[in-house]
C-alpha cells in the first residue's frame, strides 16, 4: 500500500475534533491550525534554511580536510547526518500544513519520519566516538600517537552509522499509513496495535540508548577531561573541546522534550486525556528535536567568532579554523619517551 488514490474531498478536517458545527454545511473546510503546530512550522522553516545551508557549508569545508585531519572527519559525519534529516523537512512541513494529512504514500511514511531518529542515533554515536577520541587524547596520548589515524576514524564512523541504522529499524517497521474515514485524511504514524509491550520496549530502548546512557557516560567522560584540563593548566587552545561540549549539551537539551513525551505516551492509554494532549504536542517536540540539525553550524560560527575576537574572516575560512584544527599528537613528527610529560600536558587542551 504505497500510495493512496486520495483526493482531498469537498469537506475538511474539522481540526481533529469529534464535533461538527451543524450550522456549517458539511462540505466546508476548517482551516485552523493548533498553536503547537504553528510553532512547529516556524521551527521547521528556520531549521530547514539554516540546516541545509549551514550543514552544506560544513560538509564543503570539512570534505577537503577529511583526508588528513581527524577532527574534520568527525564534523563531516555529524554534518551529513544533520543534512540528511533536513531533507525530510519540506514533506513534514507540508503534512502539518494539511492538518497532518499524509499524501506521500507508505514508503515515504516509513522512511522520512525515521530520518530524525536515524539522525538521533547517528549523532549520539558519533558524539560518543568523538568524546572517546577526546578522552584518549587526554589520557592515552602515546596510544594516540601510534594508532590514531584517519583510517581508524572512518571505521569508527562506519560502525556508528551501522548501529544507528540498526537502532532505527523498529521505528521504520512499525510506521504505517492509516486512512481515516472522517474527517477524511491519511495519517502517517506508528501502529503497534496488539503489542503495547513492544511499543514500550522500543520507547525504553530509545530513551536509554539514545539519551540516558549517553548522557551518563558523556557527562562522566567530560568531567574527567575538564578536570584534567584545568588541573594541568593547558597551554593550547581549548577550542575543539569547547565546541564538542557545546554540541553534546545541545543534543541533550533539544532531545529532552521528545524523549519525555515519547516514554509517557508509550505508558499511557491512547484514549486518555493526557495522551491526547501529548499527541497534540508531538509535532512541536519533533520540531524541537530537529533544532539539533541546524544548531551545530551555529555553534561552529559562534565558536569561530569567539576565537577570532570578531568575524574578520570569510565564513568558510572561519569554519575551517574551528573544524579542522588537528590535535597536538599528530603535529609531533618525532616522539620519544622524554616528550611524554610535555605531551600529556599539551593534550589537555584538545
Amino acid at each position: 500500500m504505497d500510495s493512496f488514490n486520495y483526493t482531498t474531498p469537498d469537506y475538511g478536517h474539522y481540526d481533529d475534533k469529534d464535533t461538527l458545527d451543524l450550522n456549517t454545511p458539511v462540505d466546508k473546510t476548517s482551516n485552523t491550525l493548533r498553536v503547537p503546530d504553528i510553532l512547529a512550522l516556524v521551527i521547521f522553516a528556520v531549521v530547514f534554511l539554516v540546516g541545509v545551508l549551514g550543514n552544506a557549508l560544513v560538509v564543503w569545508v570539512t570534505a577537503f580536510e577529511a583526508k588528513r585531519t581527524i577532527n574534520a572527519i568527525w564534523f563531516l559525519n555529524l554534518a551529513v547526518a544533520d543534512f540528511l534529516s533536513c531533507l525530510a523537512l519540506p514533506i513534514l512541513f507540508t503534512s502539518i500544513v494539511q492538518h497532518h494529512h499524509w499524501p506521500f504514500g507508505g514508503a515515504a511514511c516509513s522512511i522520512l519520519p525515521s530520518l530524525i531518529l536515524l539522525n538521533m542515533y547517528a549523532s549520539i554515536l558519533l558524539l560518543a566516538t568523538i568524546s572517546a577520541d577526546r578522552f584518549l587524547l587526554v589520557f592515552k596520548p602515546i596510544w594516540c600517537q601510534n594508532f590514531r589515524g584517519a583510517g581508524l576514524a572512518w571505521i569508527a564512523c562506519a560502525v556508528a552509522w551501522g548501529l544507528a541504522l540498526l537502532l532505527t529499524i523498529p521505528s521504520f517497521l512499525y510506521r504505517v499509513v492509516r486512512e481515516e474515514y472522517f474527517p477524511p485524511k491519511v495519517l502517517c504514524g506508528v501502529d503497534y496495535s496488539h503489542d503495547k509491550r513492544r511499543e514500550r520496549a522500543v520507547a525504553i530502548v530509545r530513551l536509554v540508548l539514545g539519551f540516558l546512557w549517553p548522557l551518563l557516560t558523556l557527562t562522566i567522560c567530560y568531567t574527567f577531561i575538564l578536570l584534567r584540563t584545568w588541573s594541568r593548566r593547558a597551554t593550547r587552545s581549548t577550542k575543539t573541546l569547547k565546541v564538542v561540549v557545546a554540541v553534546v549539551a545541545s543534543f541533550f537539551i533539544f532531545w529532552l522534550p521528545y524523549q519525555v513525551t515519547g516514554i509517557m505516551m508509550s505508558f499511557l492509554e491512547p484514549s486518555s486525556p493526557t495522551f491526547l494532549l501529548l499527541k497534540k504536542l508531538d509535532s512541536l517536540c519533533v520540531s524541537f528535536a530537529y533544532i539539533n540539525c541546524c544548531i551545530n553550524p551555529i555553534i561552529y560560527v559562534v565558536a569561530g567568532q569567539g576565537f577570532q575576537g570578531r568575524l574578520r574572516k570569510s565564513l568558510p575560512s572561519l569554519l575551517r579554523n574551528v573544524l579542522t584544527e588537528e590535535s597536538v599528537v599528530r603535529e609531533s613528527k618525532s616522539f620519544t619517551r622524554s616528550t611524554v610529560d610535555t605531551m600529556a600536558q599539551k593534550t589537555q587542551a584538545v
Epitope: 481533529d16 464535533t19 461538527l20 451543524l22 458539511v26 474515514y181 472522517f182 503497534y192 496495535s193 491512547p270
Partner: antibody, heavy 125, light 112 residues
Framework: QVQLQQSGAELAKPGASVKLSCKAS????????MHWVKQRPGQGLEWIGY????????KYNQKFKDRATLTADKSSSTAYMQLSSLTYEDSAVYYC??????????????????WGQGTTLTVSS | DVVMTQTPLSLPVSLGDHASISCRSS???????????LHWYLQKPGQSPQLLIY???NRFSGVPDRFSGSGSGTDFTLKISRVEAEDLGVYFC?????????FGSGTKLELR
Amino acid sequence: QVQLQQSGAELAKPGASVKLSCKASGYTFTSYWMHWVKQRPGQGLEWIGYINPSSGYTKYNQKFKDRATLTADKSSSTAYMQLSSLTYEDSAVYYCARVPLSYGSSYGPYFFDYWGQGTTLTVSS
Amino acid sequence: DVVMTQTPLSLPVSLGDHASISCRSSQSLIHSNGNNYLHWYLQKPGQSPQLLIYKVSNRFSGVPDRFSGSGSGTDFTLKISRVEAEDLGVYFCSQSTLVPLTFGSGTKLELR
C-alpha cells in the same frame, strides 16, 4: 417515520449492469449520507461506499471503485447504485443505510442508524 | 484493510443467560481525535441489520439497558445481561475509524 425503500429483486447475466435504487422518506434526504453495504448468503457484511446527497461527493471501497457508481437524485430523494461488469460473486443482498451527521453526544457520520430492507441480486447465465 | 475478528462464531444460550461476544481488530481503532469508532449491529433472521451500540458503549435509542459495550484500541466486548427471545440473531461488530469501513464475520446467538 424514517423509511428506506429499496427496489425489488434483480436477475442479471454475467458482464451486464444493474442499477439499484433506495427511496428515502420521513427525513430531509440531503442532511444524511447514504452508504451501500453488500451481504453474500450466509456471510458477513461488506462496505461498498457512500454518497453525500447534498454535494454529490462519493467515496468507495477500493475493491468496488471500478465497478460501483453511486448517484443521488435530490428531487425524488432517491439514492442509486449501479454495478457494472457483473460476475457470479456479485450475487448478494445489497442494503442502503443512512448515516446521521450527529446523534446524541456524537458528532460525525460514523454509524448506520436506519437500513433499507435489501435488494437481492442474482447473477446467473 | 482492518480485519475484524469476532469470537465465538456461534453462541448457544438459554433464555435469561448472560452472553458475551468479543471483537478484535487487526489495527488500533483509536481515531486521531481519541475516540474508538466501534459499533454493534444485530441482524434478526430475515431482517436488515439494526444498530444496537455506537462508539463502543453508547446504546442507540430504544435499545434495552441489558446491552452494554466496552473496550478500546483493538479489543472490544458486547455483553447481554439477561438474554431474551428477541435478542436471538447474528451480531456484527463494525468499525468506522478507517477506510474502508469493515465488519466482523458475525456471531450467531441461538437457543441451546
